[in-house]
Interface confidence: low
C-alpha cells in the first residue's frame, strides 16, 4: 500500500498554515477526498503531492491515496483537522438522499478533535432527533443514522460546545426515499374487452403505492368516470380500486379506457380497448397466400389467425386430397390470446403425396368458418429422349415432367460430345409450344417436344435441355451410322 507523509492517521493544523500531503508509492497514485478547490497538485510530481498554502476549515476531511496501476494493492488514508474556533464544522454536503433501510451519513466534520466528546445532532428548530432514530458520531465521517426511515427525512444541524458556547452548523437536508420511489403501480383489467350488446362487463382499474397520498381515476376517452373508490391496505401497501360494472353494454360504452394513477413522483397510465358488437363473430385470415408452392422435401408452416367472440368451441385441420395414400397424421398447434387465436399446421419435408388442399374449420356461437390452402409441389425436370421414324423421316421425341412446366431447348452439336452449350451448338431450337400430355392439379406437368430432323446427320449429338425454377436437366442422342440402322447410345447425360 502507498505511504502518506506525514504519517497519520490524523493530522491537526491551525488555519493559515501550509500543509503538504505526499504519497509515496512505486507507481502512479491518485488522491481522493475534499480536494478541489482547496488544494494544488505539485507539478513536479503530479498526483503524488497535495499542497495548500493557506489551510482553512474547509480543508478538514479524509484524504485517500490509491495506486492507479494496482487498486487491489490497497490505499492509505489520513484525516486532516484544521481547528478553527470560528468554524467548528465543515459540511461536505447540504443535501443527502438515501433509500429507506440504508445508513445515512450526515457529513458534518468536526474541525477540532478535542470537540468530539461534546457533539450532538438536532433537528432544525431545536427539536430532538426522533426517539426511534439510531445514530452515532464519527469524527471522520459525521453523524451516521442507522437504518434511515422515511420518518427521518428532515433538516439536521450538528452542534458542539466551544469554550462553553454552543457552535451550530448550517442545515443538512436528509431525504429518505422508499425502497421503490416511483409512481403507483397500476393494473387495468382486462387488457382488451369485447362484448355483444346487452351482455354484462366489468373494467377494473387498480393502483398500489407505499404511501397513501396517491390518486387513481378511470377514463373513457377524455371523460373521467365517476366511480366509487375502494381502498385497502395490504402488506404495507395501499391499494385503490375503481371498478366499472355494466349490466347490459351498449355501443356508447365502447372506446378506449385509461387507468391513470399519480403521486408526487409521477403518473402511470394503462389503456385498453372495449369493443361492443352487434353479434358473435368469427373471422379467419392468413398473412400467407392461400396458394402455396414449395419444392419436394421442403418444410412449411400454414398459419391462420382467428378473431373471435365468444370463444372458439371447435376447430380442426383436414387434408382434402387428392392423394390419400400414405398420409401422415397432421401436426398442428393452437396459440390463444385475448379474442385471437393462431392456428399453425406443420408440414415437414413434404412428399409428393402431401400436395393438395388443407382445410381449417373453426366454430363458435357465430357458426362455422373455414379457410383452404392449396399446396402445390415443385419438381425439377426429368427428361427422356427417344428416336422414331415418322413417315420415313427421323424425329426425336423429348418427354419431360416437372412443375412448374419446364422449358425445352434443342441443340445440335458436332461430334460425339456429352457437353454442349449454345455457343458451341450448330443449331438451337426453342420449343415454345410443346404438347402437354398431362396437367393434373397438384401433380407434375408432362410435356412432349418433337424435333423433326429429316435425316439424322452422321457424327452429330442432339441435346434436349429442360429448365424450370427448381432445376434443369438434359439428355442427348447420338446418331451412329451403321449401314441403314440408327442407334441410341447406351450412355446418356442427366443433370438435375
Amino acid at each position: 500500500a502507498p505511504v502518506i507523509e506525514p504519517s497519520g492517521p490524523e493530522l491537526v493544523v491551525e488555519p493559515g498554515e501550509t500543509v503538504t500531503l505526499r504519497c509515496v508509492s512505486n507507481g502512479s497514485v491518485e488522491w481522493d477526498g475534499p480536494i478541489s478547490p482547496y488544494w494544488t497538485l505539485d507539478p513536479e510530481s503530479p498526483g503524488s503531492t497535495l499542497t495548500t498554502r493557506n489551510a482553512t476549515f474547509k480543508n478538514t476531511g479524509t484524504y485517500r491515496c490509491t495506486e492507479l496501476e494496482d487498486p487491489m494493492a490497497g490505499s492509505t488514508t489520513i484525516h486532516l483537522y484544521v481547528k478553527d474556533p470560528a468554524h467548528s464544522w465543515n459540511l461536505l454536503a447540504q443535501e443527502v438522499t438515501v433509500v429507506e433501510g440504508q445508513e445515512a451519513v450526515l457529513p458534518c466534520l468536526i474541525t477540532d478533535p478535542a470537540l468530539k466528546d461534546s457533539v450532538s445532532l438536532m433537528r432544525e428548530g431545536g427539536r430532538q432527533v426522533l426517539r426511534k432514530t439510531v445514530y452515532f458520531f464519527s469524527p471522520w465521517r459525521g453523524f451516521i443514522i442507522r437504518k434511515a426511515k422515511v420518518l427521518d427525512s428532515n433538516t439536521y444541524v450538528c452542534k458542539t460546545m466551544v469554550n462553553g458556547r454552543e457552535s451550530t452548523s448550517t442545515g443538512i437536508w436528509l431525504k429518505v426515499n422508499r425502497v421503490h420511489p416511483e409512481p403507483p403501480q397500476i393494473k387495468l383489467e382486462p387488457s382488451k374487452l369485447v362484448r355483444i350488446r346487452g351482455e354484462a362487463a366489468q373494467i377494473v382499474c387498480s393502483a398500489t403505492n407505499a404511501e397513501v397520498g396517491f390518486n387513481v381515476i378511470l377514463k373513457r376517452g377524455d371523460t373521467k368516470l365517476e366511480i366509487p373508490l375502494n381502498s385497502d391496505f395490504q402488506d404495507n401497501y395501499y391499494k385503490k380500486v375503481r371498478a366499472l360494472s355494466l349490466n347490459a353494454v351498449d355501443f356508447q360504452d365502447a372506446g378506449i379506457y385509461s387507468c391513470v394513477a399519480s403521486n408526487d413522483v409521477g403518473t402511470r397510465t394503462a389503456t385498453m380497448n372495449f369493443q361492443v358488437v352487434e353479434s358473435a363473430y368469427l373471422n379467419l385470415t392468413s398473412e400467407q397466400s392461400l396458394l402455396q408452392e414449395v419444392s419436394v422435401g421442403d418444410s412449411l408452416i400454414l398459419t391462420v389467425h382467428a378473431d373471435a367472440y365468444p370463444s372458439i368451441q371447435h376447430y380442426n385441420w383436414t387434408y382434402l386430397g387428392p392423394f390419400f395414400e400414405d398420409q401422415r397424421k397432421l401436426e398442428f398447434i393452437t396459440q390463444r390470446a385475448i379474442y385471437r387465436y393462431t392456428f399453425k399446421l406443420f408440414l415437414n419435408r413434404v412428399k409428393a403425396s402431401e400436395a393438395g388442399q388443407y382445410f381449417l374449420m373453426a366454430q363458435n356461437k357465430a357458426g362455422w368458418n373455414n379457410l383452404t390452402f392449396e399446396l402445390t409441389l415443385r419438381y425439377p425436370p426429368e427428361v427422356s429422349v427417344t428416336w422414331m421414324p415418322v413417315n420415313g423421316s427421323d424425329v426425336l421425341f423429348c418427354d419431360v415432367s416437372g412443375y412448374p412446366q419446364p422449358s425445352v431447348t434443342w441443340m445440335e452439336c458436332r461430334g460425339h460430345t456429352d457437353r454442349c452449350d449454345e455457343a458451341q451448338a450448330l443449331q438451337v431450337w426453342n420449343d415454345t409450344h410443346p404438347e402437354v400430355l398431362s396437367q393434373k392439379p397438384f401433380d407434375k406437368v408432362i410435356i412432349q417436344s418433337q424435333l423433326p430432323i429429316g435425316t439424322l446427320k452422321h457424327n452429330m449429338t442432339y441435346f434436349c435441355k429442360t429448365h424450370n425454377s427448381v432445376g434443369n436437366s438434359s439428355q442427348y442422342f447420338r446418331a451412329v451410322s451403321l449401314g441403314q440402322s440408327k442407334q441410341l447410345p447406351d450412355e446418356s447425360l442427366f443433370t438435375p
Epitope: E100, R131, V179, Q234, D235, N236
Partner: antibody, heavy 119, light 106 residues
C-alpha cells in the same frame, strides 16, 4: 425501557371465548402498529392480527378471520385480542409485538402468554 | 399463502460458521426477516429486509438473498446461539413464517 406484558391466558374449554391483554410501556404506544403472533406446540410462528396506530384498520389472516378481534386503547397503552369459538388448534403461546411502521415485520415482542384449549 | 421452507435442525460446534436457508414458494423480493427464539424466551428480530442488521445485534449475524432463496449466517457460532431461528416474509399478504430451524451446539 420498552416493555410489553401479556395477560389473560390460561386453560379454556373449546367453544368458549377469551380476551388477551398486552400492557405497553417505555415507548410511544400510539405511534406504532401492533400485532399478535402465536407459537403453537410443535409448530412454527403464526401471525394472527395487526392493528394500525389509530386503531381504525385491522388485519387478519383468513385462518382466524371472524373469530379473532384485535383492538387497542391508546390512552391506557394496552393492546387486546378477543378470541371467540376457541378450538384445540388455538392452543399456543400468544405474543404481542410492535410492527415496523413501514414493513410488516415485528421489532419488539412481549414475553408471551399461554392459552390452552382443552375439555 | 406464501410458504417458507427451512431445514428443521442443525448441530454445529462453537467457532464454526453456520448457514440456515429459507426458500419461498413464490418471489418475496427482499422482504425476508430473521428472528431468534431461545428456549423459554420471546422471539427477537435479528435481520430485516434480507440483509439489514437490527441495532444491537452482533455483526456475527448476517443475511442475504432475494426472490425465493435466502440465507442466514452466524460466523462464528457461540455457545449462547442455541435457539430456533425463523424466517418471515412480508411481501405477500398475509405475512408468513418459516417452520423454524433449531440450532444446537455440539
Amino acid at each position: 425501557d420498552r416493555q410489553m406484558v401479556e395477560s389473560g391466558g390460561g386453560l379454556v374449554r373449546p367453544g368458549r371465548s377469551l380476551k388477551l391483554s398486552c400492557a405497553a410501556s417505555g415507548f410511544t404506544f400510539s405511534n406504532y402498529y401492533m400485532a399478535w403472533v402465536r407459537l403453537a406446540p410443535s409448530k412454527g410462528l403464526e401471525w394472527v392480527a395487526s392493528i394500525s396506530p389509530s386503531g381504525d384498520n385491522t388485519y387478519y389472516p383468513d385462518s382466524v378471520q371472524g373469530r379473532f378481534t384485535i383492538s387497542r386503547d391508546n390512552a391506557e397503552t394496552t393492546l387486546y385480542l378477543q378470541v371467540d369459538s376457541l378450538r384445540s388448534e388455538d392452543t399456543a403461546t400468544y405474543y404481542c409485538a410492535t410492527r415496523h411502521y413501514g414493513y410488516s415485520f415485528f421489532d419488539y415482542w412481549g414475553q408471551g402468554v399461554l392459552v390452552t384449549v382443552s375439555s | 399463502d406464501t410458504v417458507l421452507t427451512q431445514s428443521p435442525a442443525l448441530a454445529v460446534s462453537p467457532g464454526e460458521r453456520v448457514t440456515i436457508s429459507c426458500r419461498a414458494s413464490e418471489s418475496v423480493s427482499t422482504l425476508i426477516h430473521w428472528y431468534q427464539q431461545k428456549p423459554g424466551q420471546q422471539p427477537k428480530l435479528l435481520i430485516f429486509l434480507a440483509s439489514h442488521l437490527e441495532s444491537g445485534v452482533p455483526a456475527r449475524f448476517s443475511g442475504s438473498g432475494s426472490g425465493t432463496d435466502f440465507t442466514f449466517t452466524i460466523d462464528p457460532v457461540e455457545a449462547d446461539d442455541t435457539a430456533t431461528y425463523y424466517c418471515q416474509q412480508s411481501w405477500n399478504d398475509p405475512p408468513t413464517f418459516g417452520g423454524g430451524t433449531k440450532l444446537e451446539l455440539k
